[in-house]
């Protein structure tokens, strides 16, 4: 069974001091990752017993193995069902605690009832505050039965449930009609899936005979031991104040387990700790009684004395539960109640015995669950005992179960059953996960789901370059931590596999499936330098840069230009995909914007250091285009242009710019400024005769505006070759501005 205990502190003078603690003794409990099992959950279950809403309860985790619920503000907060869930996968187990109000009208004589399939269960509700009304019994919150108030027997209302079956399990309550549900008596009925002393799918297997009030689990045949007892059959008492499957937990506080209710996995239910009884577990056992709820009687013989925590303490020369066995009868000594081995191992099992006459090698035998008897291969004889060593054949899963060591001499015989758990070494079901990669290292998460049994003691990561025949490199890592594979080759694929191990000899599992992980390419190290930039328009910027002159090949795939518009909080990134490029034209920028510009070399996804930044101010956008541009030849060397001013001007025009180009010519166009913005006409002089020209123009305010439509016109024929075009405004014939 899962080692899970729910403790309730029942010192109820102040609800604010009340707390529930759930403690797990499971390996790896509460780590919370897929591979190692989900965390402990502790909560109030309001599905059946609902209480008025109050402030939320506080959940505190103490490490991965313990969780505590506090923050109860009034007694009614405590009433109801609480549950703790722990364990992983198929072992996920819910432990339930039912809390009754000490001031309720009706109180249960016994809260938890564990019965066998087919038994008759009797639930007894004691009258605490009498009401002369009927009593309603409910099962899991639904109406079940009514008793007339006259039907109380000796101040108790009894509910008899004959021939109970597992579906009858659940929360039962007895409530006076029209009384508050918080005044009910709440019970928990646990019906084992088998008859008394049986377990298994068809109830065909025999329980081991649980001692000291332990209850045989109907699914796996294990004894769920009361708090304070341990061993395969609960044969061993823990030291006072200890609990848990291996007595590994300790009751908090100076008064030990007084005032604590212990709830364990079904079919045990809840009880006081060993040595305590009463509704609040605050009363010590009466003389002659011991164990959980003081349910056990000592009946010590041969001068044994009764200890309320552990039972009979035998005088020298006697042993046994009641000190009924003479030490002359052979006795198995210090046999572990549970042993764990890994599948396909061949362990050695020791069994020691004492007695008079002294046991010899042949008088000690080992019996497997299938009835096979093993004889010891050697024995070590010491003055006070003989230890027989058994070499076990290769273990198979069917060897899991109860083994028995038996000693027989003429003085009698003794046997000790112990549980052998054959565990399957873990095998990863998935490949490890790549978290991050660099040029020479891979960071890998080795935590993967696995088949077989935990806990995981070591994780080995095996890796080598893909398609390589070289030996695998191996690194042993902590199960809970990511691992960095270092000193790898850049831009190389590696095959990576996980191997998991569990404790013990032969605990190494098979290697998991491989995965391919590729290292990044080397980080680019060179820092570019911005060398120049110039504005090619209100929204266009030409940028040039250089790289330091260093020997060796250039490590890089290209450049990233970054433009930061601090006013708008926007970044523009321009990728230049050639590492040979040293210039770029940035278009579609926002006119009139102050940009911070830098450039970085990149390689794969890695960025190198940025150049020191430049600050660039783009000119504002110019005005709209002039309208209705028209050209008219005046002579063999003159053409007159006329136009209309642009509409919707954002401000006064500072000048016009005319572009002149020979139609079909290959040369650069000529730009001529018209410095009198009020004009709507100008004469372009110095043109060649009989030549076709193209004209367009634009206005300037702070920046140059949009171009107008293009117009064509030819000069008149038979003139001389002119020196080149010039412009003359209609009102400014005295000055030519080329």
């Amino acid at each position: 069974a899962v080692d899970l205990t729910l403790l309730a502190n029942l010192r109820l003078t102040d609800p604010q001091r009340f707390f529930l603690t759930c403690v797990s003794g499971e390996a790896g409990a509460g780590r919370g990752s897929d591979a190692w099992g989900p965390p402990l959950l502790l909560e109030k279950d309001d599905r059946i017993v609902r209480t008025p809403p109050g402030p939320p309860l506080r959940l505190a985790r103490n490490g991965s193995h313990q969780v505590t619920l506090r923050g109860f503000s009034k007694p009614s907060d405590l009433v109801g069902v609480f549950s703790c869930v722990g364990g992983a996968g198929a072992r996920r187990t819910r432990v339930i605690y039912v809390h009754n109000s000490p001031g309720a009208h009706l109180l249960p004589d016994k809260v938890t009832h564990t019965v066998n399939k087919g038994d008759t269960a009797v639930l007894s509700a004691r009258v605490h505050k009498e009401k002369q009304t009927d009593v309603i019994w409910k099962s899991n919150g639904s109406y079940f039965y009514t008793l007339d108030w006259h039907e109380a027997q000796d101040g108790r209302f009894l509910l008899q449930l004959p021939n109970v079956q597992p579906p009858s399990s659940g929360i039962y309550s007895a409530t006076y009609l029209e009384a508050s549900p918080l005044g009910s008596a709440f019970f928990r009925l646990i019906v084992r899936g088998c008859g008394a002393g049986r377990w298994g799918p068809g109830c065909t297997k025999e329980c081991p005979g649980c001692l000291h009030g332990g209850v045989c689990h109907d699914h796996d045949g294990e004894c769920v031991c009361p708090p304070g007892f341990t061993g395969t059959r609960c044969e061993q008492a823990c030291r006072e104040g200890r609990f848990g499957q291996s007595c590994q937990e300790q009751c908090p506080g100076i008064s030990g387990c007084r005032g604590l209710t212990f709830c364990l996995p079904d079919p045990y239910g809840c009880s006081c700790g060993s040595g305590w009884r009463g509704s609040q577990c605050q009363e010590a056992c009466a003389p002659g009684h011991f164990g959980a709820d003081c349910r056990l009687q000592c009946q010590c013989q041969n001068g044994g004395t009764c200890d309320r925590f552990s039972g009979c303490v035998c005088p020298s020369g006697w042993h046994g539960v009641h000190c009924e066995k003479s030490d002359r009868i052979p006795q198995i000594l210090n046999m572990a109640s549970e042993l764990e081995f890994n599948l396909e191992t061949m362990p050695r099992i020791n069994c020691a015995a004492a007695g008079n006459p002294f046991p010899v090698r042949g008088s000690i035998e080992l019996r497997k669950p299938d009835g096979t008897v093993l004889l010891s291969t050697k024995a070590i004889v010491e003055p006070e005992k003989t230890t027989a060593e058994f070499e076990v054949p290769r273990l198979v899963l069917a060897d899991s179960g109860f083994w028995e060591c038996r000693v027989s001499t003429s003085g009698g015989q003794d046997s000790r059953r112990f549980k052998v758990n054959v565990k399957v070494p873990p095998v990863p079901l998935a490949a490890p996960r790549l978290l991050t990669k660099q040029s020479r290292q891979l960071v890998v998460s080795p935590l993967v789901s696995f088949s077989g049994d935990g806990p995981i003691s070591t994780v080995r990561l095996h890796y080598r370059p893909q398609d390589s025949t070289m030996d695998w490199s191996t690194i042993v890592v902590d199960p809970s931590e990511n691992v960095t594979l270092m000193n790898l080759r850049p831009k190389t694929g590696y095959s990576v596999r996980v191997q998991l191990s569990r404790p013990g000899e032969g605990g190494e599992g098979a290697w998991g499936p491989p995965t391919l992980m590729t290292t990044d390419c080397p980080e680019p190290l060179l820092q570019p330098w911005l060398e120049g930039w110039h504005v090619e328009g209100t929204d266009r910027l030409r940028v040039s840069w250089s790289l330091p002159l260093v020997p060796g090949p250039l490590v890089g795939d290209g450049f990233l230009l970054r433009l930061w518009d601090g006013t708008r909080g926007q970044e523009r990134r321009e990728n230049v995909s050639s590492p040979q490029a040293r210039t770029a034209l940035l278009t579609g920028l926002t006119p009139g914007t102050h940009y911070q510009l830098d450039v970085q070399l990149y390689h794969c996804t890695l960025l190198g250091p940025a150049s020191p930044p430049a600050h660039v101010l783009l000119p504002p956008s110019g005005p709209p285009a002039p309208r209705h541009l028209h050209a008219q030849a005046l002579s063999d060397s003159e053409i007159q242009l006329t136009w209309k001013h642009p509409e919707a001007l954002p401000g006064p025009i500072s000048k016009y710019v005319v572009e002149v180009q020979v139609a079909g010519g290959a040369g650069d166009p000529l730009w001529i400024d018209v410095d009198r913005p009020e004009e709507t006409s100008t004469i372009i002089r110095g043109l060649n005769a009989s030549t076709r020209y193209l004209f367009r123009m634009r206005a300037s305010i702070q920046g140059l505006g949009d171009w107008s439509n293009t117009v064509e016109e030819s000069t008149l024929g038979n003139g001389l070759q002119a020196e080149g075009p010039v412009q003359e405004s209609r009102a400014a014939e005295e000055g030519l501005d080329q």
Partner: antibody, heavy 119, light 107 residues
Framework: EVQLLESGGGLVQPGGSLRLSCAAS????????MYWVRQAPGKGLEWVSV????????HYADSVKGRFTISRDNSKNTLYLQMNSLRAEDTAVYYC????????????WGQGTLVTVSS | DIQMTQSPATLSLSPGERATLSCRAS??????LAWYQQKPGQAPRLLIY???NRATGIPARFSGSGSGTDFTLTISSLEPEDFAVYYC?????????FGQGTRLEIK
């Protein structure tokens, strides 16, 4: 062997001018960005100005902007710092330093030249 | 601008001892931090760049570590020639900035 040799320091009155030079040898000067860094007496290091390998890019600390001009002559393997409108707080040892190829670190430094601004 | 703060201002140790110098940035500088050594009357010398990379010719007793805002220069066993002033410098954000220096003196 990389060598940087500063010159041109000296005593100057407030408001005056000086031109510092830094002669470089032992490496391809035109392939590296260059810095001027200064250190006031008994104080720490302060970056002053930087210039790109071809000289197309220059940048200045706020404390000297508009007064100092960095330039270089790659044909002469020489770095310059023209300092105008000098103030008392400009008094320092001025170092020229080479920019490391992989970032804004300074891998080689000159021995420094002392500039004293005092009336 | 990113402020760089070095501590302690002065560190007094004996040859053979281990020296640990700290540098803290006013905001994260990733791993973009360098250390320089300056002896009296001399120019600074680059020791460590990008947090942990030793510059050419720097002995193995000098090592750097840290990331984000907190960085450490460690000299594993002090030699007589190591007593000097040490400066840190960031290159994460422009402009580059230096710490005010830590003076390492002989005890």
């Amino acid at each position: 062997e990389v060598q940087l040799l500063e010159s041109g320091g000296g005593l100057v009155q407030p408001g005056g001018s000086l031109r510092l030079s830094c002669a470089a040898s032992g490496f391809t000067f035109s392939g590296y960005g260059m810095y001027w860094v200064r250190q006031a007496p008994g104080k720490g290091l302060e970056w002053v100005s930087v210039i790109s390998p071809s000289g197309g890019y220059t940048h200045y600390a706020d404390s000297v902007k508009g007064r100092f001009t960095i330039s270089r002559d790659n044909s002469k393997n020489t770095l310059y710092l023209q300092m105008n409108s000098l103030r008392a707080e400009d008094t320092a040892v001025y170092y020229c330093a080479r920019a490391y190829s992989s970032g804004w670190y300074l891998d080689y430094w000159g021995q420094g030249t002392l500039v004293t601004v005092s009336s | 601008d990113i402020q760089m703060t070095q501590s302690p201002a002065t560190l007094s140790l004996s040859p053979g001892e281990r020296a640990t110098l700290s540098c803290r940035a006013s905001q994260s500088v990733s791993s973009y931090l360098a250390w320089y050594q300056q002896k009296p009357g001399q120019a600074p010398r680059l020791l460590i760049y990008d947090t942990s990379n030793r510059a050419t010719g720097i002995p193995a007793r000098f090592s750097g570590s840290g990331s984000g805002t907190d960085f450490t220069l460690t000299i594993s066993s002090l030699e007589p020639e190591d007593f000097a002033v040490y400066y840190c410098q960031q290159r994460s954000n422009w402009p580059i900035t230096f710490g005010q220096g830590t003076r390492l003196e002989i005890k």
